[in-house]
Structures are given as structure tokens and as C-alpha cells.
Interface confidence: medium
């Protein structure tokens, strides 16, 4: 296993609508012809995963339907969005890259991204 | 776990066609991207064309207009036409399967083009 350096954005805001978008980049030592991404989400220092998509390279990002991330693909970078987000989602959610093939294998882990999540306040009731 | 079963390679002449089948089983609803890969006699191995659940597809350069991936969800398979067929595309072909747990190969099956 070889190191690979990842880099994402340190801080998103989702928007009212619950969607948080952001880009993870790798920095790809070889020409990789299968691609494995994973984001993880740390909160209270427990470590979940949130969605895992393996593409291949020149080939969209297609994550699993009942996937809540949704995402594409362009050389080196991967353009994420997490769907859905409530303000209890908050936290830090990491980008995880790994070549798979052909042989050597890397892996990458980026510094995170924090997500902040706030409820939309519900509308006032009207009179009219 | 997914296994993967081609068939369909044998012996043809230059310009010749065949037609590659990789039959999925177990886990397939877990599988997003298939490809064929293929291993020339002494060389490693070479990503030949890919397709995703949604159909999008992509070829390596030595083979676009000529071989053409496709995929049948109804059926499980992925397939490969292969048409001008060339001496150098001579080799074993792999079936690969992709998805959020799953990575598969299939176990090969010999094309030998040859007059």
C-alpha cells in the first residue's frame, strides 16, 4: 500500500435544502484505471460510512441508487454531493481515495471537509 | 459475492468478428460498472471498454469504432462485439465487475486472431 495525497475543502455549508457539495481531489502517482471513492463521516469521534462509489477512469462516478451522494468525475478530481443532510448530520465527512488498479495500490486520505447543517425554520402560520 | 462467466472467444480470422459474453451471478445488485479487460500473450493487462449502470461507455483508443460494449440488466451480461478483428488483438479477455463492495474478475476467455 502507498500513500497518496488527497485534498478537499475545509469547510461547506449545506444548503436549506439539506444538499452539501464539494470537490475531493487526488494527487494520482500512476495511471489508474479503477478509481474507489469513499466519504466517511467522524462526529463524537466515531467514524461512519456515508457512501462508496468505484468508476472507472474516462467513466462517470455512479454511486448505488438508494445512495444518498451523488457525484461525477474529471481527472482527478471527484465533485461530491451529500443529499438529505439535517442539522444532526453535522460533522466532519473525509474523502477517501483509492486506486485500485492496475497494481500498486495507493490509498489516500484527505483532512475532511466540516458540513454544516441548519434546519430551515419552519414557516409561520398566515392569516391570508 | 458476484461471479462472472464469459464465453464466445475462439479462433478468427483478420477482419473477422466475435461477439464476448460475461454472465453475472450472485450480488448484482451491488455491481455499477463492468468492463473487459484483456491480457496479450507477455504483455499485462489493458483496460479494453467500460460501461456504467446508467450506460455510459468508454474504450481504449486501439479499439474504438471497431468493438462495441453493451449491457443487458435484464439479462445479467455484459457483452463485447468485436468486429476488424487485428492479429494484436489476439489475447485473453477478462470480464470485471465494479461496485460499492464489489470487484470481480471473470476467468478469461482465449481470442486468437490468426489466418
Known amino acids: 500500500c502507498k500513500a497518496m495525497h488527497v485534498a478537499q475543502p475545509a469547510v461547506v455549508l449545506a444548503s436549506s435544502r439539506g444538499i452539501a457539495s464539494f470537490v475531493c481531489e487526488y494527487a494520482s502517482p500512476g495511471k489508474a484505471t479503477e478509481v474507489r471513492v469513499t466519504v466517511l463521516r467522524q462526529a463524537d469521534s466515531q467514524v461512519t460510512e456515508v457512501c462508496a462509489a468505484t468508476y472507472m477512469m474516462g467513466n462517470e462516478l455512479t454511486f448505488l441508487d438508494d445512495s444518498i451522494c451523488t457525484g461525477t468525475s474529471s481527472g482527478n478530481q471527484v465533485n461530491l454531493t451529500i443529499q438529505g443532510l439535517r442539522a444532526m448530520d453535522t460533522g466532519l465527512y473525509i474523502c477517501k481515495v483509492e486506486l485500485m488498479y492496475p497494481p500498486p495500490y495507493y490509498l489516500g486520505i484527505g483532512n475532511g471537509t466540516q458540513i454544516y447543517v441548519i434546519d430551515p425554520e419552519p414557516c409561520p402560520d398566515s392569516d391570508f | 459475492e458476484v461471479q462472472l462467466l464469459e464465453s464466445g472467444g475462439g479462433l478468427v480470422q483478420p477482419g473477422g468478428s466475435l461477439r464476448l459474453s460475461c454472465a453475472a451471478s450472485?450480488?448484482?445488485?451491488?455491481?455499477?460498472?463492468m468492463a473487459w479487460y484483456r491480457q496479450a500473450p507477455g504483455k499485462g493487462l489493458e483496460l479494453v471498454a467500460g460501461?456504467?449502470?446508467?450506460?455510459?461507455?468508454n474504450y481504449v483508443d486501439s479499439v474504438k469504432g471497431r468493438f462495441t460494449i453493451s449491457r443487458d440488466n435484464s439479462k445479467n451480461t455484459l457483452y463485447l462485439q468485436m468486429n476488424s478483428l487485428r492479429a494484436e488483438d489476439t489475447a485473453v479477455y477478462y470480464c470485471?465487475?465494479?461496485?460499492?463492495?464489489?470487484?470481480?474478475w471473470g476467468q478469461g476467455t482465449l481470442v486468437t486472431v490468426s489466418s
Open positions: 470485471r465487475a465494479l461496485g460499492g463492495a464489489v470487484a470481480a
Open positions: 450472485g450480488s448484482i445488485f451491488s455491481i455499477n460498472h
Open positions: 460501461v456504467n449502470s446508467r450506460g455510459t461507455t
